[in-house]
């Protein structure tokens, strides 16, 4: 049901004993009410009554979910990863049908040796996690495998992973060029066919804090932005203090509206404050009463 609720001007008392005048809501504003049992509550902006209080949806808070938060929690992953799909041709092992069966002794032994070899090849890459054979096929042994890379999330994670994938390419090219059969014999742990080395595909974790911030801010997406502190992204409105984008309301309080951040100026015993940033003070005139 719709209810018509009278709303008067709200005066907020500041710490200096001053007041902040907030605009009064039109008395005929329709507000949706949710009723649970004999409780009746006004939960705005998609909030719902849980029997005790309004449970608000991001980015709202307050008794009736009428206020907009100054910051929204965004949680980048602890780590980000890349997966490289590679093919190499191993010449020091001859292909047998048993290698197709991942539970066979042949496959297990090949997997152990191949993993050892790749761990040696990529040992200098801090992002390297390991290899995973996806398929073995005829041609001495054509090894389709994934090289897995991982790093801690930082704003520059894509650059770090891109650099790591380049080093992987260099190292696998080097080893498959150097470790080759001589007189039908391999003196290395494994030998390769130089021409059989190919990078098929590279997939990098996609995480964009700006996109997450905008999505969570919903209709306020144009006014929330991402700033970094200690390499951690923060989704903030200009009303959040302590950031480069923070709005300085001087003698006032910052409040979000659908038109962006605005300053609600205070009135003290001695001054009225006005202006976009509440930085223009007008001294109240004093009337002296003589007895």
């Amino acid at each position: 049901p719709l209810a018509t609720i009278p709303v008067s001007t709200t005066s907020l008392t500041s710490s200096e004993g001053s007041t902040i005048s907030t605009p009064s809501v039109d008395i005929s504003t329709p507000v949706t009410t949710s009723i649970v049992g004999d409780q009746c509550s006004r939960c705005k902006n998609g909030g719902f009554w849980d029997g005790l209080k309004c449970q608000c949806l991001t980015p709202y808070y307050g008794e009736s979910c009428e206020e907009v938060v100054n910051s929204i929690d965004i949680a980048p992953p602890e780590t980000v990863s890349a997966q490289m799909e590679l093919t190499v041709t191993v010449t020091s092992v001859k292909f047998t049908d048993e290698l197709k069966n991942h539970s066979s002794q042949e496959f297990r032994e090949f997997n152990k040796t191949f993993t050892e070899q790749m761990n040696i090849v990529y040992s200098g890459i801090p992002e390297y996690v390991g290899v995973n054979i996806t398929n073995l096929r005829l041609g001495s042994v054509v090894v389709e495998h994934d090289v897995l890379l991982r790093t801690k999330y930082t704003p520059e994670y894509k650059t770090a992973l891109d650099n790591a994938t380049e080093v992987v390419k260099q190292k696998i090219t080097k080893v498959t060029t150097e470790q080759i059969m001589t007189n039908d014999n391999c003196s290395a742990l494994m030998c390769f066919n130089t021409t059989g080395t190919q990078v098929q595909n590279i997939t990098v974790t996609q995480y964009d804090p700006v996109e997450e911030c905008r999505q969570k801010a919903e209709e306020y997406e144009d006014y929330f932005l991402v700033e970094y502190r200690d390499q951690k992204p923060y989704c903030i409105s200009p009303c959040e203090s302590g950031f480069n984008a923070s709005k300085n309301c001087n003698h006032g309080k910052c409040q979000m509206s659908q038109n962006g951040a605005r300053c609600l100026c205070v009135t003290t015993e001695t001054h009225w404050y006005s202006g976009e940033d509440c930085n223009q003070g007008t001294q109240k005139s004093h009337h002296h009463h003589h007895h």
Epitope: V93, T96, S104, E109, K112
Partner: nanobody, 123 residues
Framework: EVQLVESGGGLVQPGGSLRLSCAAS????????MSWFRQAPGKEREGVAI???????GYADSVKGRFTISQDNAKNSLYLQMNSLRAEDTAVYYC?????????????????WGQGTMVTVSS
């Protein structure tokens, strides 16, 4: 589990011959590869000879023309016939096995090993 037991080692004079045997438990000869390695005192283990289930054999340059690797699948045994022995052939000889059809004389490529048999070439 594969178990390998070598025998046939001993003392032999330079220019003499010796035949090493390796008895294997488990069905390792019908598929995969078998090989002989050796390790001289203070030196790294090195490949001597290799034989695969597809009939391929390979030898280290230092033993080519002098040593012959063979196997008897019925007896699950591997052999190394060593002729024209030299002092530098003195070492502990190891039998190794793999389920893979290998072309590698690098010890790291091999997964199953015997305890070894000592061959001393001395006058």
């Amino acid at each position: 589990e594969v178990q390998l037991v070598e025998s046939g080692g001993g003392l032999v004079q330079p220019g003499g011959s010796l035949r090493l045997s390796c008895a294997a438990s488990g069905n390792t000869f019908s598929r995969g590869s078998m090989s002989w390695f050796r390790q001289a005192p203070g030196k790294e283990r090195e490949g001597v000879a290799i034989i695969s289930s597809d009939g391929w054999t390979g030898y280290a340059d230092s033993v080519k023309g002098r040593f012959t690797i063979s196997q008897d699948n019925a007896k699950n045994s591997l052999y190394l016939q060593m002729n024209s022995l030299r002092a530098e052939d003195t070492a502990v000889y190891y039998c190794a096995a793999s389920f893979l059809v290998l072309r590698a004389l690098n010890p790291k490529a091999w997964h199953y090993w015997g305890q070894g048999t000592m061959v001393t070439v001395s006058s």
